[in-house]
């Protein structure tokens, strides 16, 4: 039985050219996290973080994606095309798969703020 819940940074906004942290957190379960996959709005993979093998970042994003903090992902040099949904998929044992959603809006405005409901310092 899957008892865990995923908390995410929810709906966030950030400035074009800036950076943003995508963060998910799995709670209320003792399941072992074996891998976390990060997917973009077109459902393509951005990166994988395996518990033993570490990070594996899709080559096209290597210059703009930084691993962490923790199991999160930092997107850098943001463009308007980065606007959209992002998904964290937690593969766990023995529970199975948990999935979280984040919506990122990239703004031209200099007053864009990166606000989050949840953030790991």
């Amino acid at each position: 039985m899957m008892t865990g819940t995923i908390e995410t940074t929810g709906n966030i906004s950030a400035k074009k050219g800036g950076s943003v942290i995508l963060q998910c957190h799995l709670s209320s379960t003792m399941a072992q996290v074996t891998q976390v996959n990060w997917e973009q709005h077109d459902h393509s993979l951005l990166a994988i973080r395996n518990a033993e093998l570490g990070w594996h970042i899709y080559p096209a994003f290597k210059d703009r994606v930084a691993p962490g903090p923790g199991l999160g992902l930092t997107l850098q040099s943001l463009t308007m095309n980065d606007t959209g949904e992002y998904f964290c998929t937690y593969h766990t044992y023995p529970d199975g798969t948990y999935r979280g959603r984040i919506f990122l809006e990239v703004l031209e405005s200099s007053v864009a703020e990166h606000s989050a409901r949840f953030q790991i310092p």
Epitope: T34, N50, E52, G54, Y58
Partner: antibody, heavy 114, light 107 residues
Framework: EVQLVESGGGLVQPGGSLRLSCAAS????????MSWVRQAPGKGLELVAT????????NLADSVKGRFTISRDNSKNTLYLQMNSLRAEDTAVYYC???????WGQGTTVTVSS | DIQMTQSPSSLSASVGDRVTITCRAS??????LAWYQQKPGKSPKLLIY???TRQSGVPSRFSGSGSGTDFTLTISSLQPEDVATYYC?????????FGGGTKVEIK
Amino acid sequence: EVQLVESGGGLVQPGGSLRLSCAASGFTFSSYGMSWVRQAPGKGLELVATIKSSGGSTNLADSVKGRFTISRDNSKNTLYLQMNSLRAEDTAVYYCVRGYFDYWGQGTTVTVSS
Amino acid sequence: DIQMTQSPSSLSASVGDRVTITCRASQDIKTALAWYQQKPGKSPKLLIYWASTRQSGVPSRFSGSGSGTDFTLTISSLQPEDVATYYCQQYYSTPYTFGGGTKVEIK
């Protein structure tokens, strides 16, 4: 040049034990997760065990859980696979593999037979 | 666990032929797929990762494509040194699993 050199294979009776070693060179060993992958005679590839760069986290295939242990000594640039309660179906070539499978050793042969 | 199915299990082609090997995943694995070449008596060698990215030093005649559940490894012009068994592997979720292999021979 990245080099992974396995040793410790041999002929062992069912129920016996072996310890495989993999000597790594040509890269910063302590920065990479490592794996053991095996290949039974004439068969395909099976991921047996993986270990974090620091050694703090390991994962074992269901087929070997409770019998095999993966470990590493970063000060010696060496990866290990301790194999206990060996069975005939463990007969295979065992490969030491770096990271996301970008470099493989030459393999060491384990034969379990009475 | 995700099952990986390769086809054909073996093939024979002439030097210079275009060769295509397919790999099918039992569920969506996005582009988390690698291809390996294993020459007789040797250890496997990484050819392609992230479904279509050639590993450094791999000849350009090798290419990978696909996303989701269906993937292809193509050798644009088969060479004698390409005689080997080719394996696909998914790394979308643990445990990482390999296909059964495709043995490529020269006619």
